[in-house]
């Protein structure tokens, strides 16, 4: 007996071939011997089966001795043994229809769990193997679970259901609601304008919710809310903003924040949270601000950085066109009685410059002694 696997909602062709390549009598019946369809002259006739309105046959193939039955919009309960009667012989085809669905909405927040449930006909013992877009493999029986969804799990999951050495493939689109980056750092010289961007790692027709940016300045003892906003159909509206700093926010997605100028007192790290309508939990993105200042005071040239920097970052003071360099894995570096010329303050990570600031040191002439 031939076994054919089908997918719920799909269309399947059950083949039945006669030895003679000509138009002949044929009938398709179910296991209860109820006629589904057949031929009467050149007319396709339908029987009293529940399947009849969804069953069809291709007249153009009858002349080739092919008397297939096509079943549209498959249901789990269509699983049965079907009998094709042609040329005084009977061909049996066992049809097994499976359905694979996500238990919840397929738009899930990062960290949430995904459960896939397999619908299968009674008496079957299928196995399921799923592969995520990122190459993660999960397998199971009637249910499959992915405990903690990650950003890279977004996309089309390919699931293979196996039964009696036959397979049928399902594709399920999963959208993991998260920002493109978990964390980002902005490096700025003192006084420069700062741009924070929070691009989502997903696209939705409608995006509605509310969000807030909390900020922990390095110099402050506690964090404070810098801005709160609403999101309605991808339109951003600010609800409340602090007076210092006076942040500006873009009206369209991706979420975009502008700090008029980078100052040492703003250096630190923030956490932007976004609560989406009809979703439990929140999207998070951490953002860091590192501010650099280079100053000359009397005989001292100083370069400082504020904000969350890694201990492996190097801070250097370097005289342009000369070999003079002072470097430290610290947040401040200085030179006493610096030579005249253009000095560069550099913050670098393994040779890659993250931030630089130039300061001109003018020659100091000794003050003439008063007679």
């Amino acid at each position: 007996k031939k076994v054919v696997l089908g997918k719920k909602g799909d269309t399947v062709e059950l083949t039945c071939n006669a030895s003679q390549k000509k138009n002949t009598q044929f009938h398709w019946k179910n296991s209860n011997q109820i006629k589904i369809l057949g031929i009467q002259g050149s007319f396709l006739t339908k029987g009293p089966s529940k399947l009849s309105d969804r069953a069809d046959s291709r007249k153009s193939l009858w002349d080739q001795g092919c008397f297939s039955m096509i079943i549209k919009n498959l249901k789990i309960e269509d699983s049965d043994t079907y009998i094709c009667e042609v040329e005084n012989k009977k061909e049996e085809v066992e049809l097994l229809v499976f359905g694979l669905t996500a238990n919840s909405d397929t738009h899930l927040l990062e960290g949430q769990s995904l459960t896939l449930t397999l619908e299968s006909p009674p008496g079957s013992s299928p196995s399921v193997k799923c592969r995520s877009p990122g190459g993660k493999n999960i397998q199971g029986g009637r249910t499959l679970s992915v405990p903690q969804l990650e950003r890279q799990d977004s996309g089309t999951w390919t699931c293979t259901v196996s039964q009696d050495q036959k397979t049928v493939e399902f594709k399920i689109d999963i959208v993991v609601l998260a920002f493109q980056k978990a964390s980002s750092t902005v490096y700025k010289k003192e006084g420069e304008q700062v741009e924070f961007s929070f691009p989502p790692a997903f696209t939705l027709e409608k995006l509605t919710g509310s969000g807030e940016l909390w900020w922990q300045a390095e110099r402050a003892s506690s964090s404070k809310s810098w801005i709160t906003f609403d999101l309605k159909n991808k339109e951003v509206s600010v609800k409340r903003v602090t007076q210092d700093p006076k942040l500006q926010m873009g009206k369209k997605l991706p979420l975009h924040l502008t700090l008029p100028q980078a100052l040492p007192q703003y250096a630190g790290s923030g956490n932007l949270t976004l609560a989406l309508e009809a979703k439990t939990g929140k999207l998070h993105q951490e953002v860091n601000l590192v501010v650099m200042r280079a100053t000359q005071f009397q005989e001292n040239l100083t370069c400082e950085v504020w904000g969350p920097t890694s201990p492996k970052l190097t801070l250097s003071l370097k005289l342009e066109n000369k070999g003079t360099t002072v470097s430290k894995q610290a947040k401040a570096v200085w030179v006493l009685n610096p030579e005249a010329g253009m000095w560069q303050c550099l913050l670098s990570d393994s040779g890659q410059v993250l931030l630089e600031s130039n300061i001109k040191v003018v020659p100091t002439w000794p003050t003439p002694v008063q007679p």
Epitope: K7, G9, D10, T11, V12, E13, G41, S42, F43, L44, D56, R58, K59, S60, D63, I70, I71, K72
Partner: antibody, heavy 115, light 107 residues
Framework: QVQLQQWGAGLLKPSETLSLTCAVY????????WSWIRQPPGKGLEWIGE???????NYNPSLKSRVTISVDTSKNQFSLKLSSVTAADTAVYYC?????????WGQGTLVTVSS | DIQMTQSPSSVSASVGDRVTITCRAS??????LAWYQHKPGKAPKLLIY???SLQSGVPSRFSGSGSGTDFTLTISSLQPEDFATYYC?????????FGQGTKLEIK
Amino acid sequence: QVQLQQWGAGLLKPSETLSLTCAVYGGSFSGYYWSWIRQPPGKGLEWIGEINHSGSTNYNPSLKSRVTISVDTSKNQFSLKLSSVTAADTAVYYCARVINWFDPWGQGTLVTVSS
Amino acid sequence: DIQMTQSPSSVSASVGDRVTITCRASQDISSWLAWYQHKPGKAPKLLIYAASSLQSGVPSRFSGSGSGTDFTLTISSLQPEDFATYYCQQANSFPYTFGQGTKLEIK
């Protein structure tokens, strides 16, 4: 709701090979046959051929020697290749789903053969 | 090949008119016939299949009849959106063939 979206080169020189692809979205790919039909300017519709998900084909005898229809089930796509084209192959080419009747159809692609 | 012949090749009518288009097959095709509506720049649309079955979503003013070699498409009361070219198609045997079309124009 099943939708068919087609694409391919619109301008060819005589003797070149016409190549079109049709992608099936939002519906079943298996169980159906997938056809190519063309309509030369100011003329009627002409069936070119068909394929099913397992690669079984039927072609119009008038074009059989020049036609190849192939299928890529992993992408729910099927393609048409028509070799050694002449000006007589200038037409709007349509892809369509078929059991016995053509429904739905792709949006059509105008292919012009000109030297 | 089965030849499909439509008549008339064009017809002029007014909104509200009853219009009949005929299609003749060169051999018996039982009821393996479909009717399509085709508008310029659009894809053809299935109206009637199996000679007389109305495709889902098609207005009931369209009807089909016939069996064997002679078939008819009737539009009971023409609407402005019905002005188009109509084709019949046989699904009895390969190659599938279409009628040459009937252009329905506004009088």
